[in-house]
């Protein structure tokens, strides 16, 4: 027994001593060097930390725990052997001594030993559970890492595939761009060639235009000569008429001997006895300025002063403010009498305005306004109309109330555009309005869907360009 105690001491383990009577029992149990120190007591049901230890540390710790378990197992076996041996000896001693009390001591010692063993077993179970828990945790971590790695590998593969696709697309687009560039260069060359051709054409046209302008100048000069001749002829005719009137003064007392003949309008010409259609010289009272006007002495009782006529497109009506003011064209053909003369005339007494229209299908219509006058130039020759009757529409195609007169160089309309430039010709444009009798002249079969034709909406509708128009005035009381 002493021998055993000595060998146990030499190992240097913790001693458990029980003193009973003359006998003293000493048990040596192994110390777990690698277990927790007393400063941080072990709690079997402690919550594990969230972040697991690094993989290598965990492996090392597992190995240490395995070693400890192995040691503990060996110690337990030794302890069992020792207890068995010791019990045999004790039983012999008990039997020899036959001391009843010693039995109780032995039971107590046994109980203590069993308790110690149970405690050790519990601790071992806890350690085992901990090891198992840690192992499971590590396995899970490894699995997660494995899955994550797989996922990353898949993503890398997908990205690589995507990059390849993009590279293919990029190269395709590069080819396309190059092809387009080539095409563009060819087109540019083609455009340049066309431009050069057009420039040649423009040069040719310019020279033709110059020729035409020269011809126009010549024609204008000839026209002026003809007009002068006509004027002279008219004067001669008037002189002859005067002479005839003078010789027949007894028969016609209306013209006294030596009286100067001048007519303000065709109504006066008609009343003086000139009842044939034709061009007459008109002069405003208290004025020396003369104008040539065509007089219609047949329609509706005669005495009509023609202030506008369109019939064949021979005269350009896209004229300046000044030209529309003084008048232009040929009184026996297409012409505009002149805004200034008409303004002065219609402000001296009340006049009616009749607009006679012809379409390309052989139809005729008219609009009659019972009161018409133009404002002065300061008020842009604004048109004033009242009392519409006639067959060319129940609604006035000249916008009401009247608008200012506009020409290509005088924009007095109510449009954000310039109506005179857009529709051509001078007119009392609104924005731009239902009429324009000074628009472009279009021949038959080319006269529909026109944006700038000779228009009278409330008779022929939009886009219909008329064949002929006549605007005529006469005193209201004629």
């Amino acid at each position: 027994y002493n021998n055993f105690r000595k060998s146990m001491d030499s190992i240097g383990k913790k001693q458990y001593q029980v003193q009973h009577g003359s006998c003293s029992y000493t048990f040596l149990l192994p110390e777990m060097d690698n277990c927790r120190s007393s400063s941080s007591p072990y709690v079997s049901n402690a919550v594990q930390r969230d972040a697991p230890l690094e993989y290598d540390d965990s492996v090392q710790r597992l190995q240490v725990l395995e070693n400890i378990m192995e040691n503990n197992t060996q110690w337990l076996m030794k302890l069992e052997n020792y207890i068995q041996d010791n019990m045999k000896k004790e039983m012999v001693e008990i039997q020899q001594n036959a001391v009843q009390n010693q039995t109780a001591v032995m039971i107590e010692i046994g109980t203590n030993l069993l308790n110690q063993t149970a405690e050790q077993t519990r601790k071992l179970t806890d350690v085992e559970a901990q090891v198992l828990n840690q192992t499971t945790r590590l396995e899970l971590q490894l699995l997660e890492h494995s899955l994550s790695t797989n996922k990353l590998e898949k993503q890398i593969l997908d990205q690589t595939s995507e990059i390849n696709k993009l590279q293919d697309k990029n190269s395709f687009l590069e080819k396309k761009v190059l092809a387009m560039e080539d095409k563009h260069i060819i087109q540019l060359q083609s455009i340049k060639e066309e431009k050069d051709q057009l420039q040649v054409l423009v040069s040719k046209q310019n020279s033709i235009i110059e020729e035409l302008e020269k011809k126009i100048v010549t024609a204008t000069v000839n026209n002026s000569v003809l007009q002068k001749q006509q004027h002279d002829l008219m004067e001669t005719v008037n002189n002859l008429l005067t002479m005839m009137s003078t010789s027949n003064s007894a028969k016609d007392p209306t013209v006294a001997k030596g009286e100067q003949i001048s007519f303000r309008d065709c109504a006066e010409v008609f009343k003086s006895g000139h009842t044939t259609n034709g061009v007459y010289t008109l002069t405003l009272p208290n004025s020396t300025e003369e104008v040539k006007a065509y007089c219609d002495m047949e329609a509706g009782g005669g005495g009509w002063t023609i202030i506008q006529r369109r019939e064949d497109g021979s005269v350009d009506f896209q004229r300046t403010w000044k030209e529309y003011k003084v008048g232009f064209g040929n009184p026996s053909g297409e012409y505009w009498l002149g805004n200034e003369f008409v303004s002065q005339l219609t402000n001296q007494q009340r006049y009616v305005l009749k607009i006679h229209l012809k379409d390309w299908e052989g139809n005729e219509a008219y609009s009659l306004y019972e009161h018409f006058y133009l404002s002065s130039e300061e008020l842009n020759y604004r048109i004033h109309l009242k009392g519409l009757t006639g067959t060319a529409g129940k609604i006035s195609s000249i916008s009401q109330p009247g608008n200012d007169f506009s020409t290509k160089d005088a924009d007095n309309d109510k449009c954000i555009c310039k109506c005179s430039q857009m529709l051509t010709g001078g007119w009392w444009f609104d924005a731009c309005g239902p009429s324009n009798l000074n628009g472009m002249y279009y021949p038959q079969r080319q006269n529909t869907n026109k944006f700038n034709g000779i228009k009278w909406y409330y008779w022929k509708g939009s886009g219909y360009s008329l064949k002929g128009t006549t605007m005529m005035i006469r005193p209201a009381g004629f």
Epitope: C415, I416, C417, A431, G433, N449, F451, S462
Partner: nanobody, 129 residues
Amino acid sequence: DVQLVESGGGLVQPGGSLRLSCAASGFTLDDYAIGWFRQAPGKEREGVSSIRDNDGSTYYADSVKGRFTISSDNSKNTVYLQMNSLRPEDTAVYYCAAVPAGRLRFGEQWYPLYEYDAWGQGTLVTVSS
């Protein structure tokens, strides 16, 4: 020469749909406004919808708002009128017409009927069960 040709008319049941086309030639849509008009027997011609390409604005008559949609395709020089939820009172001859976009009175957005100078021949739309 300026020309407008309508197509797409026909017989359709109430609640049905039709798409009218107006093909323009002789001018480009950029500088013009295109209007759709209709005329029922014995009635006045009335404006249905208009589109102005230079600023993208559109106009609809109260009677067709929410049912009709006007659009244009400049590459085809064509204007369309998509007509949904058709009613018997939509029965009429439908015309498209053109007006220079700038022909606008100061302060106004759309054009009187008489400003539309170019017209198509029309296409008949009949809504009946």
